[in-house]
């Protein structure tokens, strides 16, 4: 008896974070024996879509011509071969930006910061929100969440970084969202360039919370420390 069919690979092009109205293609890659591909969307009737394989039959394309709220969510795909259906793929989380007006991102006291000092990135929204995300460009794990307790609505979140090192330098944006759908984000804030001056030999910042630092600097770009100041927000690392 052969084992279960290997799970397919699921990905999105040009990426899994898509602005409202833009097109996105979801790809599911299985094996050459695949006869049919099925895409399921969490909390939607299954199957969400079915496609015949493209030659040489080891993958299928699911097209979304114009991204809207309805397409945002968590997807898995399967393929069918002569011996049955495969295991599900790992999930793909398709996120739509542009659902809400853009927040404002500021650096306190300044985006020009000396190594070893402290800086706070402040993300502020017009509408009451319950989740704020800070994203650093070109970082392996770029997301840092602040999520309010008990769904309380907030207009801002503070992301303190201390002590700052050269690792913290770079371009940041923030987003806001509502807890009822983490797949719907605001427009991105305007970019904020954080410039760190000082010694190149700075030690890595040591977090005051249990954050894995086994990865290299670009895998752990953000090291906020200290408590969240009276905001009712809870910090989440991703």
């Amino acid at each position: 008896q052969a084992g279960p069919l290997p799970k397919p690979t699921l990905w999105a092009e040009p990426g899994s974070v898509i602005s409202w109205g833009n097109s996105v293609t979801i790809w599911c890659q299985g094996t050459l024996e695949a006869r049919e591909y099925r895409l399921d969307k969490e909390e939607s009737p299954a199957p969400w879509d079915r496609q015949n394989p493209l030659e040489p039959k080891n993958k299928a394309r699911f097209s979304i011509p114009s991204m809207t709220e309805d397409y945002a969510g968590r997807y898995r795909c399967y393929y069918r071969s002569p011996v049955g259906w495969s295991q599900p793929s790992d999930p793909l989380e398709l996120v739509m930006t542009g659902a809400y007006s853009k927040p404002t991102l500021s650096a306190l006291p300044s985006p020009l910061v000396t190594s070893g000092k402290s800086v706070t990135l402040l993300c502020q929204s017009r509408s009451p929100m319950d989740t704020f995300l800070l994203i650093k460009e070109r970082a392996a794990h770029p997301l840092l969440h602040l999520r309010s307790e008990h769904g309380a609505q907030q207009h801002q979140a503070e992301f303190p970084m201390s002590p700052v090192t050269s690792v913290h330098g770079g371009t940041y944006r923030c987003f806001s969202s509502h807890g009822f759908s983490h797949y719907l984000l605001s427009h991105p804030s305007d970019p904020l360039e954080l410039i760190v001056s000082g010694s190149l030999e700075d030690p890595r910042p040591s977090p005051t919370r249990s954050v894995s630092t086994a990865a290299g600097p670009e895998d752990q770009p953000l090291m906020p420390t200290g408590s969240v100041p009276h905001s009712g927000l809870r910090r989440h690392w991703e």
């Epitope: 927040p103 404002t104 706070t120 402040l122 929204s125 207009h155 100041p229 009276h230």
Partner: antibody
Amino acid sequence: QVQMQQSGTELMKPGASMKISCKATGYTFSTYWIQWIKQRPGHGLEWIGEILPGSGTTNYNENFKGKATFSADTSSNTAYIHLSSLTSEDSAVFYCARRLGRGPFDYWGQGTTLTVSS
Amino acid sequence: DIQMTQSPSSLSASLGGKVTITCEASQDINKHIDWYQHQPGRGPSLLIHYASILQPGIPSRFSGSGSGRDYSFSITSLEPEDIATYYCLQYDNLLPTFGGGTKLEIK
């Protein structure tokens, strides 16, 4: 609790300059924008502009550029509006207010009355 | 600039009655509107934000609604302490603008 305490009534001569203070207590002063609003007798409320004390970033209503300048002292949790070249048109009540993120103005000072008269 | 046209400019109502004030924006403001109560000798007080969210501690007699360009604010079961001037404020762009105000008197 959050409080915004403004300086008292001022009587100034035309052409002079003056400064109104707004002392904030009960919250992290550096991370909330301070708003300045003008109310002339018989008129409604007019937004002058704002300052984010932690960075000194300011935004001004074009109508008040050259007239109003904002500053803030984070060591004393105090914001200031400096008004220059005063005329009778500047006679008004000036309010400071805290802004919640980029949203509502949730706490206001009691107002400072400025009278410009020769 | 976004203009906020508030009406009426004044109104008189009986104790226990209901009043409604409206604000029309010159463009869609995406519910980015507040309502404030201003009593003489004091700073304004925030009653409603984001079109319909009641501030903590504000009685449920006060309410707000609307979307797009048109918004309204109501007070039911009028009480003597409701005598004040009421303002709307839009903050959908970098230049917040107030409505002209509505002076509420009790008959």
